[in-house]
């Protein structure tokens, strides 16, 4: 009896795993084996596909074959018993185009109200993604184990922290990778669950801000309790995309180790030009808080985000404030090539009640003032980039007296 060729050959490629599946064309014939050949583009000869010779099942793995993943290849299969079937040719394909991204590896660290997610490619040193390893982005689905209501988070990098969770609660999540440059979406990881810890009696420090004074950076934060010590760590922001890099390590700022105040001062030359992440942790000697939320810190913006310079024209019921570029040492104006908004605070000299105006314009009217009254004004600049969210320190206060009545023209 003539053997029939196998049919419906499927090629599955996940990361560096090459799997072939096919259908037997005649279930009634026993003890049949199957063999594959392959052919590279531009070659006439067929080569035996190692790992896929004399296979008794309907599946084989040819991952050991060292292929150029960007080069088209052709496969053919036949059945064998005493005689052989004719060859069945599979449509040619390019491995890279056909490949799917496998499930990533996920490691979770629990805090009381946050989870830190570390993600790495499922296949270490993958040949398939060798040129794209740093281009992976990830997305995840997270849910409370008790409710099952899913939240999706897109476009995250290899390390991501989810905040505002509940203590002592089990959360589950799954992660998949994407290579947006190649329009590839990967396979989800297995579900990972972790329980957040009991609430830490020491909350993390909050409202971390960096400002510049003289040749130093001043880092300030808020804390609930007194008599604490704090440590500050930094990381190059670009490393968040690549924790596999051996440089991915949070480092101490030497002048901010075990400080007993809610601020620390360190020289500007500690950091070269660049974008950094900063975080702060509190300790009372026995217990330690979890790390604060990380803030982004851009030396370029920080160094030049100086308090605005302004002039006041006084009227009887208002001030006109004209904001100019801040001056550097040597009295040269600083050119700021990013959009700013200005926060202007003013108050009656005899009172502590402050009022605030926020404006994008550089000429601002402060209305509803009383005649012949001394008002004080200070201002600061903010970047309009939400991610960087930087502010200058406030300018020195300038105090002026309003004019007598009926001089509002």
């Amino acid at each position: 009896k003539n053997l029939k060729s196998p049919q419906k050959v499927e090629v599955d490629i996940i990361d560096d795993n090459f799997i072939l599946r096919w259908n037997r064309s005649d279930e009634s014939v026993g003890n049949v084996t199957f063999s594959f050949d392959y052919q590279k583009t531009g070659m006439d000869n067929w080569i035996k596909l190692s790992g896929c010779q004399n296979i008794t099942s309907t599946k084989c793995n040819f991952s050991s074959l060292k292929l150029n993943v960007y080069e088209e290849i052709k496969l053919r299969i036949r059945a064998e018993k005493e005689n052989t079937s004719s060859w069945y040719e599979v449509d040619s394909f390019t491995p890279f185009r056909k490949a799917q991204i496998g499930p990533p590896e996920v490691h979770l660290e629990a805090e009381d109200k946050a989870i830190v997610i570390h993600i790495s490619p499922g296949t270490k040193d993958s040949v398939m993604w060798a040129l794209d390893g740093l281009s992976f982005t990830y997305s995840l689905v997270i849910w409370k184990n008790s409710s099952g209501v899913e939240e999706r988070i897109e476009n995250i990098y290899s390390r991501h922290k989810i905040y505002k969770l509940s203590p002592e609660t089990t959360y589950c999540l799954k992660v998949k990778a994407a290579l947006l440059t190649s329009w590839k979406i990967g396979v989800y990881s297995p579900v990972h669950c972790i329980k957040t810890t009991v609430e830490n009696e020491l909350p993390p420090p909050e409202n971390i801000e960096v400002s510049v004074q003289n040749q130093n950076y001043v880092l300030k934060w808020d804390y609930t309790y007194a008599n604490m010590t704090f440590q500050v760590q930094w990381l190059h922001a670009f490393l968040k995309r690549n924790p596999g890099n051996h440089l991915y390590k949070w480092k101490q700022i030497p002048d901010c180790e075990n400080v007993k105040t809610t601020q620390c001062v360190f020289p500007q030359n500690v950091f070269q030009k660049g974008i950094y992440l900063l975080r702060v942790q509190a300790s009372d000697g026995n217990n330690t808080s979890f790390w604060s939320e990380e803030i982004k810190f851009d030396t370029e913006i920080q160094a030049f985000l100086l308090p605005p310079v302004f002039n006041i024209r006084s009227l009887s019921d208002s001030f006109h404030i004209y904001i100019g570029a801040p001056k550097q040492s040597g009295n040269t104006p600083v050119i700021q090539d990013y959009p700013l908004i200005y926060e202007i605070i003013f108050w009656e000299n005899t009172s502590n009640a402050e009022r605030k105006i926020i404006e994008k314009k550089t000429d601002v009217t402060v209305p509803n003032l009383k005649p012949l009254t001394v008002y004080c004004v200070k201002a600061r600049a903010h970047t309009m980039d939400e991610k960087l969210n930087k502010s200058s320190v406030f300018s020195d206060a300038v105090c002026e007296k309003t004019k007598p009545g009926n001089t509002s023209k």
């Epitope: 009381d112 570390h118 810890t197 009991v198 924790p243 217990n287």
Partner: antibody
Framework: QVQLVQSGAEVKKPGASVKVSCKAS????????MNWVRQAPGQGLEWMGK????????HFNQKFRDRVTMTRDTSTSTVYMELSSLRSEDTAVYYC????????????????WGQGTLVTVSS | DIQMTQSPSSLSASVGDRVTITCKSS??????LAWYQQKPGNAPKLLIS???TLESGVPSRFSGSGSGKDYTLTISSLQPEDFATYYC?????????FGQGTKLEIK
């Protein structure tokens, strides 16, 4: 697979120093902390300290701070622990053990251990 | 330093028994707790990390629970190869500290 192979047993006199080595294989050496733990005969486990093989940053148990040195050689994926001014109570099996990834936010458990090196201090 | 107190210090049990070992820390350790098994002449072997996560290759009869300062290792049905000494360890604050150990013996 991950393997940590330690140097052989040592016999030392009180006041001397001992240097134990731990050769790592099967993983990226510079990506994980390496810890040292000791166990006196019939006793429990005692953490001595840890080293980051990528930059040699160390953290020590205060008890050993003045006597212990931890170093590494990235070319051979080996870490070393040297204990000086030995006394009889330092007789113990000394283990190296891999800790968490250096990129983790917090410390992790010790997932792989060397076979141990018996150090005997005797006059 | 954080003190870890394990109980009992020794325990006799039979194959098939359910066994529970407890570990208390002097401070809250936020689930940064590991359980190790050690057999005579061998290095410790990690069984459970993060208080509850079973390491790959560890039989499912081992389980960990607890939070705050109180943690438990349970072996649901003792097997002959489970007779050994078990240690808990906190890795929340340096220096990392271990419990004094629980020796599990055949009854």
């Amino acid at each position: 697979q991950v393997q940590l192979v330690q140097s052989g047993a040592e016999v030392k006199k009180p006041g001397a120093s001992v240097k134990v080595s731990c050769k790592a294989s099967g993983y990226t050496f510079t990506s994980y902390w390496m810890n040292w733990v000791r166990q006196a005969p019939g006793q429990g486990l005692e953490w001595m300290g840890k080293i980051d093989p990528s930059d040699s940053e160390t953290h020590f148990n205060q008890k050993f701070r003045d006597r212990v040195t931890m170093t590494r050689d990235t070319s051979t994926s080996t870490v070393y622990m040297e204990l000086s001014s030995l006394r009889s109570e330092d007789t113990a099996v000394y283990y190296c053990a891999r800790g968490g990834r250096i990129s983790f936010d917090y410390d992790a458990a010790l997932d792989y251990w060397g076979q141990g090196t018996l150090v005997t201090v005797s006059s | 330093d954080i003190q870890m107190t394990q109980s009992p210090s020794s325990l006799s049990a039979s194959v098939g028994d359910r066994v529970t070992i407890t570990c208390k820390s002097s401070e809250v350790i936020y689930n940064r707790l590991a359980w190790y098994q050690q057999k005579p002449g061998n290095a410790p072997k990690l069984l459970i990390s993060g208080a509850t996560t079973l390491e790959s290759g560890v039989p499912s009869r081992f389980s960990g629970s607890g939070s705050g300062k109180d943690y438990t290792l349970t072996i649901s049905s003792l097997q002959p190869e489970d007779f050994a000494t078990y240690y808990c360890q906190q890795y929340w604050n340096k220096p990392f500290t271990f419990g004094q150990g629980t020796k599990l013996e055949i009854k």
